[in-house]
C-alpha cells in the first residue's frame, strides 16, 4: 500500500524555538516515521533537517539549526515505513516574519506602596531578536488579587515602578513584549503575584520639582516631618531600556547628599545634555524612607523652560494678558520649539486668595475683576508632554489697577 504524504504542516516559531507540527494522513498505518528536508533561497539542493529525521510523533524541534532568520526557507516532509510517501512541500517562509515574541521573564520587588518590575526577554541572547534587543517595549496588566479589576500600562521598559499602591495587599500582573518596529506583539508571561509590605514608618518625599536659577538647578520636594536628612540620586533614563541588565547604578548628586532642607542647589554642569531620572530619600537617623517617585529630568527642556514674560492691558472688569517668549540674559527671546501650557495665578493685592487659570493660548482674559482694584499676576509655563512634565519657575508678580467702571469695550 502506498504511504500518503503528511498534511497540514504548521511552523511555530517563538523566540529561538522552531517547532513543526503536522497531521498523519493515514491513522491506520502503524510504525510510520517522518522526515523533513529544507532548502534555502537560491539553492537547488535539499538538506536533511537535523532534529526532524525519522520522527515517530507528529511534532519536532529544529531549533538547533543555525539559520539566517531573515532568509526565506522552504521545507518538505514525507512519511516512511518500508517505502516512502511522496514529498509534501510547505509554503516557503522567512523565520523572522513568522516568529512570535515569547513570554518575558518577570522579577518583582515589593515596597509598602510600590512594586518594582524587572522585565527580561524570555530567551537570553536570542538570535531571532539580536538586532532588536533595545527596541522591545512591554505592556502589563495589573490587578488587586482581591478585586480582579484590571489596569493596563503600556509602553514600559525593562524596569518599571508602580506607585500609589496599598500596603499589605497582594497584586498580580502579567507582562507581554512588543516590537513595534516589526508590528509584533508577544505572548503574556505567566501571572506573577506579590504582596506589598506593611506601611513604612517614614513616607517617601513627594512633589519633586526642578527649576533653573542662574547657572544652577534647584531641586525641591515636600516632606511630612521636620528634622530629616535627604539624599538625591540620578540615573541616565536610557539605562531603563537595557534588556537583561538589572543593575542600576544610581549616582549621588554631591551637593544633595545628607541635606537638611527640602531643597538642594547644584550647578548645571553636573549634568551633560540628556534625560535623567531623579529620586529622593528621607532619613531621620534611625529609619529611612523608601525612594520617592522617580521624576524625568530633561536638561534641554529644563535649561530653556524659563518663566514667560507678559504684558497686561487693564480694563474695568478684566485683564487681557499677552504672553511672549521669555528673554535670555542678553534680552533676546528664547525660541521654545515644544508646546507649552500656561498657568496664570492672580489675586487682589490686599488679599491672599489666589485664583488660577490654565490656558494653551498666549492671549488670556482674566475675567470678573472689580473696577479700580489692584490685582497682581504671576505666570509659569509647563510642557504639555505628560512624561516630561516640566514646569518653569513663576515669573515675578506684576501688579496693575483695573480701570473705572464701563471701560470693558
Amino acid at each position: 500500500k502506498n504511504l500518503k504524504s503528511p498534511q497540514k504542516v504548521e511552523v511555530d516559531i517563538i523566540d529561538d524555538n522552531f517547532i513543526l507540527r503536522w497531521n498523519r494522513s493515514d491513522e491506520s498505518v502503524g510504525n510510520v516515521t517522518f522526515s523533513f528536508d529544507y532548502q534555502k533561497t537560491g539553492m537547488d539542493n535539499w538538506i536533511k533537517l537535523s532534529g526532524c529525521q525519522n520522527i515517530t510523533s507528529t511534532k519536532c524541534n529544529f531549533s538547533s539549526l543555525k539559520l539566517n532568520v531573515y532568509e526565506e526557507i522552504k521545507l518538505r516532509i514525507r512519511a516512511e515505513k518500508e517505502n516512502t510517501s511522496s514529498w509534501y512541500e510547505v509554503d516557503s517562509f522567512t523565520p523572522f516574519r513568522k516568529a512570535q515574541i515569547g513570554p518575558p521573564e518577570v522579577h518583582l520587588e515589593a515596597e509598602d506602596k510600590a512594586i518594582v518590575i524587572h522585565i527580561s526577554p524570555g530567551t537570553k541572547d536570542s538570535v531571532m531578536w539580536a538586532l532588536d534587543g533595545l527596541s522591545f517595549t512591554y505592556s502589563l496588566v495589573i490587578w488587586k488579587n482581591s478585586s480582579g479589576v484590571e489596569e493596563r500600562i503600556e509602553n514600559i521598559y525593562s524596569r518599571h515602578k508602580i506607585y500609589k499602591l496599598s500596603p499589605e495587599t497582594t497584586y498580580c500582573l502579567k507582562v507581554k513584549a512588543a516590537l513595534l518596529t516589526s508590528w509584533k506583539i508577544g505572548v503574556y508571561s505567566p501571572v506573577h503575584c506579590i504582596k506589598t509590605t506593611v506601611e513604612n514608618e517614614l513616607p517617601p518625599p513627594e512633589n519633586i520639582e526642578v527649576s533653573v536659577q542662574n547657572q544652577n538647578y534647584v531641586l525641591k520636594w515636600d516632606y511630612t516631618y521636620a528634622n530629616m536628612t535627604f539624599q538625591v540620586q540620578w540615573l541616565h533614563a536610557f539605562l531603563k531600556r537595557n534588556p537583561g541588565n538589572h543593575l542600576y547604578k544610581w549616582k549621588q548628586i554631591p551637593d544633595c547628599e545628607n541635606v537638611k532642607t527640602t531643597q538642594c542647589v547644584f550647578p548645571q554642569n553636573v549634568f551633560q545634555k540628556g534625560i535623567y531620572l531623579l529620586r529622593v530619600q528621607a532619613s531621620d537617623g534611625n529609619n529611612t524612607s523608601f525612594w520617592s517617585e522617580e521624576i524625568k529630568f530633561d536638561t534641554e527642556i529644563q535649561a530653556f523652560l524659563l518663566p514667560p514674560v507678559f504684558n497686561i492691558r487693564s480694563l474695568s472688569d478684566s485683564f487681557h494678558i499677552y504672553i511672549g517668549a521669555p528673554k535670555q540674559s542678553g534680552n533676546t527671546p528664547v525660541i521654545q520649539d515644544y508646546p507649552l501650557i500656561y498657568e496664570i495665578i492672580f489675586w487682589e493685592n490686599t488679599s491672599n486668595a489666589e485664583r488660577k487659570i490654565i490656558e494653551k493660548k498666549t492671549d488670556v482674559t482674566v475675567p470678573n475683576l472689580k473696577p479700580l482694584t489692584v490685582y497682581c499676576v504671576k505666570a509659569r509655563a509647563h510642557t504639555m508632554d505628560e512624561k516630561l512634565n516640566k514646569s518653569s519657575v513663576f515669573s515675578d508678580a506684576v501688579c496693575e489697577k483695573t480701570k473705572p467702571g464701563n471701560t470693558s469695550k
Epitope: 520587588e109 509590605t197 514608618e201 538589572h246 543593575l247
Partner: antibody, heavy 118, light 107 residues
Framework: QVQLVQSGAEVVKPGASVKVSCKGS????????MHWVRQAPGQGLEWIGR????????KYAPKFQGRVTMTADTSTSTVYMELSSLRSEDTAVYYC???????????WGQGTLVTVSS | DIQMTQSPSFLSTSVGDRVTVTCKAS??????VVWYQQKPGKSPKVLIY???YRVSGVPSRFSGSGSGTEFTLIISSVQPEDFATYFC?????????FGQGTKLEIK
C-alpha cells in the same frame, strides 16, 4: 566563566596597612559593582564597602570610613581594598564579591586571610 | 544601620527534616533580602535573592519568603550536603548588613 581571584594571605603589624587585590575574569568589571566583605575567625559576615569600577565611585560602611580605600584598575580588571591603622580585631578573611543584577553579591573570591599580630 | 536578627543561631537536625530559619530586620527593607550558604573554609554562595527568588542551580528544597521586616528560609527536606551556616543579608540600604548566621548541624 566568572571568576574572582584574590591575593595571598598577609601577616601585618598593628598600626600598619594592608592592600588586598581581587582580579575578575569572565565578565567586564565596569558593568558591575565590586564589594568587600570580611569575616573574623568563627564570626559572621561584615560589609566593608563597594566600588563602581566604571567611575571609581565608592560607598563605605561608616565603621570603616576614613580607614578604608577602594580603587579599581579597569585595564587589568582588578580592584583593591586598602585598610590602614590595623588592629588585632581586623584579623579576618577578606572577600571580594561581584555586585550583579538586583544588587546581589553573586560571585565571591576565595578570600584573603589578613592576620594582625605584633 | 539596619540590624538583621537571625534565629536560631544553632540548629541540630536530621537528614529528611524540614528546617526553618528566620531573619528580622530592624526596619522595613521591602523584599530586598538575600540568603547565603557557607561551608567551612569556603566563600558564601547565594541561594535566594529578593526574598523569594531561587538562584538557578539551587535545589528546589530551598525556598524563601517574607517582606517588610520578617523573612524565612525553608529547607523542606534536609540533605547531607546542606549542613552548613546560613546568613541573611539586607540590600535595601547602605551599609549592607548581615544576620549573625545559623549553623545547621547533624543531630
Amino acid at each position: 566563566q566568572v571568576q574572582l581571584v584574590q591575593s595571598g594571605a598577609e601577616v601585618v603589624k598593628p598600626g600598619a596597612s594592608v592592600k588586598v587585590s581581587c582580579k575578575g575574569s569572565g565578565f567586564n568589571i565596569k558593568d558591575y559593582y565590586m564589594h568587600w566583605v570580611r569575616q573574623a575567625p568563627g564570626q559572621g559576615l561584615e560589609w566593608i564597602g563597594r566600588i563602581d569600577p566604571e567611575d571609581a565611585e565608592t560607598k563605605y560602611a561608616p565603621k570603616f570610613q576614613g580607614r578604608v580605600t577602594m580603587t579599581a584598575d579597569t585595564s587589568t580588571s582588578t580592584v583593591y581594598m586598602e585598610l590602614s591603622s590595623l588592629r588585632s580585631e581586623d584579623t579576618a578573611v577578606y572577600y571580594c564579591a561581584r555586585g550583579g543584577n538586583f544588587y546581589v553579591m553573586d560571585y565571591w573570591g576565595q578570600g584573603t586571610l589578613v592576620t594582625v599580630s605584633s | 544601620d539596619i540590624q538583621m536578627t537571625q534565629s536560631p543561631s544553632f540548629l541540630s537536625t536530621s537528614v529528611g527534616d524540614r528546617v526553618t530559619v528566620t531573619c528580622k530586620a530592624s526596619q522595613n527593607v521591602g523584599t530586598n533580602v538575600v540568603w547565603y550558604q557557607q561551608k567551612p573554609g569556603k566563600s558564601p554562595k547565594v541561594l535566594i535573592y529578593s526574598a523569594s527568588y531561587r538562584v538557578s542551580g539551587v535545589p528546589s528544597r530551598f525556598s524563601g519568603s517574607g517582606s517588610g521586616t520578617e523573612f524565612t528560609l525553608i529547607i523542606s527536606s534536609v540533605q547531607p550536603e546542606d549542613f552548613a551556616t546560613y546568613f541573611c543579608q539586607q540590600k535595601n540600604n547602605y551599609p549592607y548588613t548581615f544576620g549573625q548566621g545559623t549553623k545547621l548541624e547533624i543531630k
